[in-house]
């Protein structure tokens, strides 16, 4: 099974130019326990929370968020109301963090395309990504060179085509999985929207089934202390003047056992270093 990925797409509504919608999805086999949407940067790293969505407990959202909802079991949408005349959303980065079991926490960011045409609603045109497996690490540079050349060739062909737009649906998610997302631990180049900046950070799950309260519980993640990246890949892909990079920061050392965490008992780690235990709450 491939490494999980998170996609983020921001679009302007055709009817109201002051309205924006952020679409986020998780491509992986795990069970999603929480989604956090923030703007201005990643959650906890300069970003401000806009919404938190739990698959069963409900959603919490804060202005300028207008409506946060689940689109599918693995994707969400967040409608934003831009009251300002200068449209600050246009230059803002939006980030989505998916906590999933057993993978851990994955976060990606994206922003509105620089020359967004609100009238377009064409289906997404994922650019195929060549896979670089761990086994083929020696040939990675050659593959990347070939991939870049192929992408540039595709981009020249698509130069005057309209910007692809994502209309999240089960079909599109499957299309993305099949066509655009072919990740591996060594290289996770992913591109489904030429203007989406994908910056995926990852914290792995650590299992801890002995619950401190003595309850039978789902496995919970323990704290993650940085021990230096066990795997890190950043693959730039030039696409119509935009830069797409995917990073996998891997932290492996397990720390203290968390206390009772309530519904779901699923904690998700946060990749910020020693403070990195975020769970149902972000237990200290």
């Amino acid at each position: 099974a491939g490494t999980p990925e998170v996609w983020v797409q921001v679009q302007m509504e055709a009817t109201e130019l002051s309205s924006f919608t952020v679409h986020c999805g998780f491509l992986g086999p795990g069970s999603i326990s929480l989604v956090t949407v923030s703007w201005g940067g990643p959650d906890g790293a300069g970003g401000t929370k806009l919404a938190v969505l739990h698959p069963e407990l409900g959603t919490r959202q804060w202005a300028p968020a207008r409506q946060a909802r689940w689109e599918t079991q693995s994707s969400i949408s967040l409608a934003l109301e831009d009251s300002g005349a200068s449209s600050p959303f246009a230059n803002t980065t939006f980030c989505c963090k998916f906590a999933s079991f057993p993978e851990g926490s994955w976060e990606s960011c994206g922003s509105l395309p620089p020359s967004s045409d609100p009238g377009l609603s064409a289906p997404p045109t994922p650019v195929p990504i060549l896979r670089a497996d761990l086994a083929g690490i020696l040939g990675l540079s050659g593959v990347l060179l070939f991939g870049c050349g192929y992408l540039l060739h595709l981009l020249r062909r698509q130069k005057h085509r309209p910007t692809p737009r994502l209309q999240p649906s089960h079909t599109n998610s499957q299309a993305l999985t099949a066509q655009a997302w072919a990740p591996s631990q060594a290289s996770q180049a992913a591109l489904h929207d030429p203007y989406a900046t994908i910056n995926t950070s990852f914290c792995p799950a650590t299992l801890d089934t002995a619950h401190p309260n003595g309850w039978a519980s789902l496995p919970t993640h323990a704290a993650h202390q940085p021990q230096g990246p066990a795997a890190s890949a950043s693959t730039p892909i030039l696409a119509r003047g935009s830069f797409v990079s995917v990073e996998n920061g891997l932290y492996t050392q397990a720390g203290e056992r968390p206390p009772h965490t309530g519904p779901g008992l699923t904690l998700f780690p946060d990749c910020r270093g020693p403070r990195a235990l975020e769970g149902r709450f972000g237990v200290r």
Partner: antibody, heavy 114, light 113 residues
Framework: EVQLVQSGAEVKKPGSSVKVSCKAS????????IEWVRQAPGQGLEWMGE????????NYNEKFKGRVTFTADESTSTAYMELSSLRSEDTAVYYC???????WGQGTLVTVSS | DIVMTQSPDSLAVSLGERATINCKSS????????????LAWYQQKPGQPPKLLIY???TRESGVPDRFSGSGSGTDFTLTISSLQAEDVAVYYC?????????FGQGTKLEIK
């Protein structure tokens, strides 16, 4: 262990204000919102609103808008609910809660009486 | 706002018998995207804060005895206690977790017959 500990009971005069505190521990305070719910004697539960510590973003129940203020102090992991222009019908137990009402404070009884 | 209506207002059941509390919402609490119902049930004993029992209409909170179960979809939901115990005497509330503002039912007082 996640805990929400509230301040003690208050007796207030009509027209005055009350400020109830809620100290959180056992989790990262800024991760999730603190909800405020009140319960009049023998009555049901009524959501007043919420605050997200860190950004101090708030949502208010329209019924209380203009009369209630939520604040949060990240340094002490404490949230506050201030209700002004008190009247006798504000006599109730005020609860703080977090994570979709999964955790609750013990409640603070506010009695408004002349 | 979504209005939550519980029935009955009070209920007396013999120990070991089944207790059933109903909750009706003025709007559907089903999210069509992920097919989840956003309804929660709480138990409140005298002098205590409410305690979360069930969320997502049917998921039991950790530590809640399995005699408690939740069912239903859309606008009609049920909390069932399969075999009433003395410690189950309390007021039970359903809650709309679907949309703002969160709203609660008026409560159902459960007593022993």
């Amino acid at each position: 262990e996640v805990q929400l500990v509230q301040s003690g009971a208050e007796v207030k005069k009509p027209g005055s204000s009350v400020k109830v505190s809620c100290k959180a521990s056992g989790y990262t305070f800024s991760s999730f919102s603190i909800e405020w719910v009140r319960q009049a004697p023998g009555q049901g539960l009524e959501w007043m609103g919420e605050i997200l510590p860190g950004s101090n973003s708030t949502n208010y129940n329209e019924k209380f808008k203009g009369r209630v203020t939520f604040t949060a102090d990240e340094s002490t992991s404490t949230a506050y609910m201030e209700l002004s222009s008190l009247r006798s019908e504000d006599t109730a137990v005020y609860y703080c809660s977090s994570y979709w009402f999964a955790y609750w404070g013990q409640g603070t009884l506010v009695t408004v009486s002349s | 706002d979504i209005v939550m209506t519980q029935s009955p207002d009070s209920l007396a059941v013999s120990l070991g018998e089944r207790a059933t509390i109903n909750c009706k919402s003025s709007q559907s609490l089903l999210n069509s995207g992920n097919q989840k119902n956003y309804l929660a049930w709480y138990q409140q004993k005298p002098g205590q804060p409410p305690k979360l029992l069930i969320y997502g209409a049917s998921t039991r909170e950790s530590g809640v005895p399995d005699r408690f179960s939740g069912s239903g979809s859309g606008t009609d939901f049920t909390l069932t206690i399969s075999s009433l115990q003395a410690e189950d005497v309390a007021v039970y509330y359903c809650q709309n977790a679907h949309s703002y503002p969160p709203t609660f039912g008026q409560g159902t007082k459960l007593e022993i017959k």
